[in-house]
């Protein structure tokens, strides 16, 4: 179907900075330290290849990756197909974030990544600590009061939480561009669904208590005829593709070696268990620590608090996919009416979860709209 997969792309072994400079773009690399000691790599593409001479402040755009992913998501295609490069060439000051636990955010001032304590986090902490620290850093560095936030998948989830619970942070967001938004996962058809059959008392037994490696857990649910061909074999053993789904028709297969070498970028077992709880409950709420006593210690209440997206007044534009297994259209349908400042919505009927970052036609379907909307915002 796909022929042989040849690892021919040099970016396979590169880090984020190297990938950016490989394509001839300027790169700045920073370390942001969160309030609880996590050290997150943040990259900046201050301008494009052809507009370095333009003086004056450029609007700041911050890109936040999704579940099991990293900042490389935004730069894994050729420059004319990668959102980070497209935005830089359009005259914007582009910043790429990383969430704790991924390849580029696996250090802490107090804990080693070999320790259980390092991995005791979920998307709650990404919203509570990672986003504020990174956005504060960008605001200070650029001297600009506001920025445009682009999130994909879990990058939207932590945006919903942070901007609805932290009003001072919300004030710093000019517009929130949400790609494949995830709040509730009540209707998800992703294989993440299968994790809900694992009882809480057995989750750590099966997956450990540090980084999430599904090993061969999902094999029992994968149709063997789908996963028999060489390239599909590679996808079928990759946690990102297992959980998000994949669509061979819209992929540039010559870039698959890059996608596979940089993904999954890693997250904690606790984070995956939080997502499992969300599938089970059908609700958008904080991590359930497993007992009323434990929850009281963390939240001063016996049940984990719900996240209320109606409290988020940031202007938001939403793109979702009709074939998205993780951000199911029914869940998106529940989300949209709750957004008090929804300024745009587009459903792309044939898009799946990863098409928003890697599809060959993503510029036409999504990115050009974002560029236009940011430029309208400048006026």
């Amino acid at each position: 179907l796909f022929g042989k997969l040849h690892p021919g792309s040099p970016e396979v072994t590169m880090n984020i900075s190297q990938m950016i400079t490989y394509w001839g773009y300027p790169n700045e690399e920073y370390e942001v330290v969160t309030e609880d000691g996590y050290i997150l790599e943040v990259n900046r593409i201050p301008y494009g290849k052809k507009n370095s001479g333009n003086t004056g402040q450029r609007p700041v755009v911050f890109l936040q990756h999704g579940l099991l992913a990293s900042a490389t998501n935004w730069i894994s295609n050729l420059p004319n197909n990668s959102l980070a490069f497209i935005l830089a060439d359009a005259g914007y000051d582009v910043w790429l974030g990383n969430s704790r636990g991924n390849t580029w955010a696996r250090r802490n001032l107090y804990y080693s990544p070999d320790s259980v304590e390092f991995w005791a986090f979920s998307f709650d902490e990404m919203a509570k600590y990672d986003l504020p620290a990174t956005i504060d850093f960008i605001v200070k560095k650029t001297g600009q009061k506001q920025l445009h936030y682009v999130g994909h998948s879990q990058g939207t989830t932590i945006g919903f939480i942070a901007f609805s619970t932290n009003p001072s942070l919300a004030k710093r967001i000019k517009t929130f561009y949400a790609l494949a938004p995830v709040a509730t996962v009540k209707y998800t058809k992703s294989l993440i669904n299968k994790l809900r059959f694992v009882p809480q008392s057995l989750f750590k037994f099966i997956f450990g208590d540090k980084i999430f490696y599904p090993h061969n857990f999902f094999d029992q649910f994968l149709a063997t005829e789908v996963c028999s061909r060489e390239m599909l074999n590679l996808l079928c053993s990759n946690a990102l593709f297992i959980i998000c789904g994949f669509d061979s028709k819209n992929f540039n297969t010559s870039r698959l070696d890059v996608y596979l070498s940089h993904n999954p970028a890693g997250t904690s077992v606790q984070n995956m268990f939080h997502w499992t709880q969300a599938v089970k409950s059908g609700k958008f709420q904080a991590y359930d620590w497993g007992s009323p006593v434990q929850n009281r210690m963390h939240y001063d209440q016996s049940q984990p608090p719900y996240y209320n997206v109606t409290a988020m007044n940031v202007p938001i534009a939403v793109w979702n996919g009709g074939k998205d297994l993780l951000a199911d259209p029914q869940d998106v349908g529940l989300l949209l009416p709750k957004l008090p400042n929804l300024i745009y919505h587009k459903e792309i009927p044939f898009y799946n979860h990863l098409d928003f970052i890697w599809a060959m036609d993503a510029p036409q379907e999504v990115y050009n709209d974002i560029v236009s909307m940011i430029s309208e915002d400048k006026k």
Epitope: S115, V116, P199, S201, L202, K204, F205
Partner: nanobody, 120 residues
């Protein structure tokens, strides 16, 4: 030193039954969870069934309705009753226990394995 010892493996005909046992010794704590994995030469070790100290169980799809996991918490012992055995159940079966004195000192403890061979 915590040690896990499996027993009960052997050769059985397709459709037959076996009962595997695994006993822990040297442990100063009760395991939070115990379970069984299996491995065929050249393949990854795979989960078969697990049981928590709260009695919650998990089975992989291929053994549901045929295998039953049980546990004696006080003895840190786990059993796997295997019936309607198939040739594809042939593997080395390993016992695993997970526990520790605190949530930050939990470890996985493994047995040496016991061979189960199902002939057609």
């Amino acid at each position: 030193q915590v040690q896990l010892q499996e027993s009960g493996g052997g050769l059985v005909q397709a459709g037959g039954s076996l009962r595997l046992s695994c006993a822990a010794s040297g442990s100063t704590f009760s395991f939070n969870a115990m379970g069984w994995y299996r491995q065929v030469p050249g393949k990854q070790r795979e989960l078969v069934a697990a049981i928590g100290n709260d009695g919650a169980t998990y089975y992989v799809d291929s053994v549901k309705g045929r295998f039953t996991i049980a546990r004696e918490n006080a003895k840190n012992t786990v059993y796997l009753q295997m019936s309607s055995l198939k040739p594809e159940d042939t593997a080395v079966y390993y016992c695993k226990g997970r526990g520790g004195l605190t949530q930050y000192s939990e470890h996985d403890y493994w047995g040496q394995g016991t061979q189960v061979t199902v002939s057609s």
